[in-house]
Structures are given as C-alpha cells and as structure tokens.
C-alpha cells in the first residue's frame, strides 16, 4: 500500500487533459498553452473494508492544491465536486471517507473512476470539449468515462 | 429527525443468544456507518465493533469477535446485533451510534437510548 | 490491548473552566488516535462533542474545544454551565479498532 500520493497526468482517449478553470475541472484539447492539472492519488488504507473487486479504492487530489474530488447529491443527482482538502487528511481517516473515494478499474491501458459513494456512477467528460467533468451513470454514451494514466516522477 | 431507535430489553440464560436491533429515521444508514458499544453496570463504554451497511463489511474488537455479528437491512433502514453463549458478564446496556463523517472528521453524531440486556439462570 | 485512562471525577465552578484528559497505556496520544469525545447526561441520550482529536461536531456550543496536551487527549470546557454536568468518554483509535476510556464524572458546583 502506497504512504504517498502518486502524481499522474490524465487524459481522455481523445487526448484531451485536465485543466482547473475557477475551481472547476474541464477537459480541454492538449494544446501548447494549455497547462494541465497534476492529480495526486493515493489508496485508501481500509481495503479491506471495502467491496472487493470493483476496483482499487483511491483518494484523487490535485497535487500541490490542497483540492480533492468528491462526490455528493445535488438534488436527486450525484454531482462530482472539488473540495478544500489534504487528501494525506483524507487517507489518514479512521474509516473510508466514501464521498471523496473512487474505485480505479484499470483495462488494458484505460482506467474508469466509479464513486464509492455512488456504486454505478463513474467519472466522465462530454464528448465535446471544454466540458466539465461531471458523473454519469451512461458509459460509452455521449460521456466519456475511459482515461488514461501516465504516472510522473 | 435523526433517530435511532432500539428494541427492548431482554433477560436471557446463559448460553442463549439475543438480537438487538437498532431502526434509523431521518437518514438512511447506507450513507454511513453504525457502531455498537456496550456499558456494563458501573463501568465504562466498551466499543464492539461497526457496520458499513452499504456493502455490508464489519469490524469487530477482537474480545466480541466471534461472540458479536452485526449486520443490516438496509430495506427496512435497520441495523442488527447479535450476541451469542451469553454469559452473566454480557449483561450490559447496548448502544448503537452513527458515526458520520462531517466535512473533516468523524464523529458519533447520534445515538440509540440502549437496550438492557441480562444474562441470568 | 491498550487501555484508555480517564479522571474517574472532576468538579468546576459554574462560569470555570476544566479539563478532562485521555491517557493511552501505549504512550503518547497523538492526532493519529483520532480522539472522539462523548457525553452522557442523566436520562437522555449520548452526544458526540469532538471527533478527530479537535474538531467540534455540527452544532456543539463554542465552549467544548478538543487537543493534545502533555501527551494526552484533552477536552478543554470554558464557561461551564450547569447543563454540561455530565459524564464525558473519550475513544481512541489503533491502527483498525477504537478504545473507550472509563469515562469522567463533571460536576458543575
């Protein structure tokens, strides 16, 4: 188990990264002046306590911000939110924080996101561009819920 | 309101076993955990183990290992404790307790009144 | 197993201030134990004051405050008010499973 978040660098399957725009997460096109967030990850310490087989429950922040992403209800709909927090916080808790933690399923070289809170909602991005990232429950659809990972340092 | 209401007291045999439950209102336990603790007369709390509804894992003190189950109805919003081969020592008052995580830490927000229960031939 | 030690009683005077403290057998507390601290009044029901060693729980007055001190977890009571007589417990956590003390009988006199 990992005692230090891991940096990695994410995008989409049509190259498109994570960009932070007034605290909210966008994936835009890899462009020369486009600087993309760092994401920090790190497993949750209560694997055990989890279900198995759905995934590696990770914490995802974005390194050096002191920001995490959550999930919660907005209305009757799960929303994916960034929060003020240290995600070393969040991975030093007594228990899973659920809201803030997702299950990494890896495929091959695509990895999903699935809310622990919210079993069957998964981190996407709009087919179009410069869209929010949001949570959905429609894989393959209009979203896209496949990125791929590439760890740094 | 947040509630959470127990079931009733029991005077049981030793060796007998006993199934207290614990009925949540205003929240639904799926969205949190739910902690079992025990206050035997005159002496202090004593944390048996907990219950994540949602999935269904537990954790358990290693004394009540094997002497405590827990589990959840998540249907009905309800959540168990059993206890078995009682003996006069388990006679105690049973708690439950969400602990909830609130912005940045985890707390036990809320409880049951207790449930009496007495081991006695 | 470790054991969690607490003043068996302590008195205020209405207006005071206290503290109660929490001992672990294993050594120094720290903020990885996570100290809860729990009340108990006469004929009603427990309430959470403090989780994870120092944050008040959502609608606990101002005057409950949580800490380390002296190697011990605290919980700091200024401007006691006859309502606080209680009995207070503290929890700590190791590693997977969490430790009650005996609990601290507060009278306010």
């Known amino acids: 188990k990992s005692e230090m978040p891991q940096p990695v660098s994410i995008q989409d399957i049509n190259h498109r990264v994570w960009v932070l725009q007034d605290q909210i997460l966008i994936a835009v096109p890899r462009k020369d002046r486009v600087s993309p967030v760092t994401i920090s990850l790190i497993s949750c310490r209560h694997v055990e306590t989890l279900e198995k087989d759905r995934g590696n429950p990770i914490y995802l922040g974005l390194n050096g911000l002191n920001l995490c992403l959550m999930c919660a209800k907005a209305g009757d709909q799960p929303t994916l939110q960034l929060k003020e927090k240290d995600i070393m916080d969040l991975y030093n808790q007594p228990e899973p924080v659920k809201s803030f933690l997702f299950y990494h399923s890896q495929s091959g070289r695509n990895s999903t996101f699935e809310s622990v809170a919210f079993p069957g909602w998964f981190i996407a991005v709009s087919s179009e561009g410069g869209c929010p990232l949001i949570l959905t429950q429609e894989l393959g659809k209009a979203n896209t819920t496949d990125f791929g990972l590439t760890m740094l340092f | 309101q947040v509630q959470l209401v127990q079931s009733g007291a029991e005077v049981k045999k030793p060796g007998a076993s006993v199934k207290v439950s614990c009925k949540a209102s205003?929240?639904?336990?799926?969205?949190?955990?739910i902690y079992w603790v025990r206050q035997a007369p005159g002496q202090g709390l004593e944390w048996i183990g907990r219950?994540?509804?949602?999935?269904?894992?537990?954790r358990y003190d290693p004394k009540f290992q094997g002497k405590a189950t827990l589990t959840a109805d998540t249907s009905t919003n309800t959540a168990y404790l059993e206890l078995s081969s009682l003996r006069s020592e388990d006679t105690a008052v049973y708690y439950c307790?969400?602990?909830?995580?609130?912005?940045?830490?985890?707390?036990?927000?809320?409880w049951g009144q207790g449930t009496l229960v007495t081991v006695s031939s | 197993q470790a054991v969690v030690t607490q003043e068996p009683s302590l008195t205020v005077s209405p207006g005071g201030t206290v503290t109660l403290t929490c001992r672990s057998s294993?050594?120094?507390?720290?903020?990885?134990?996570?100290a809860n601290w729990v009340q108990e009044k006469p004929g009603q029901l427990f309430t959470g004051l403090i989780g994870g060693t120092n944050d008040r729980a959502p609608g606990v007055p101002a005057r409950f405050s949580g800490s380390l001190l002296g190697g011990k977890a605290a919980l700091t009571l200024s401007g006691a008010q006859p309502e606080d007589e209680a009995d207070y417990f503290c929890a700590l956590w190791y590693s997977n499973h969490l430790v009650f003390g005996g609990g601290t009988k507060l009278t306010v006199l």
């Open positions: 307790a969400r602990y909830d995580y609130s912005g940045s830490s985890f707390y036990f927000d809320y």
């Open positions: 205003g929240f639904n336990i799926k969205d949190t955990y």
């Open positions: 294993t050594g120094a507390v720290t903020t990885s134990n996570y």
């Open positions: 219950i994540d509804p949602a999935i269904g894992t537990t």
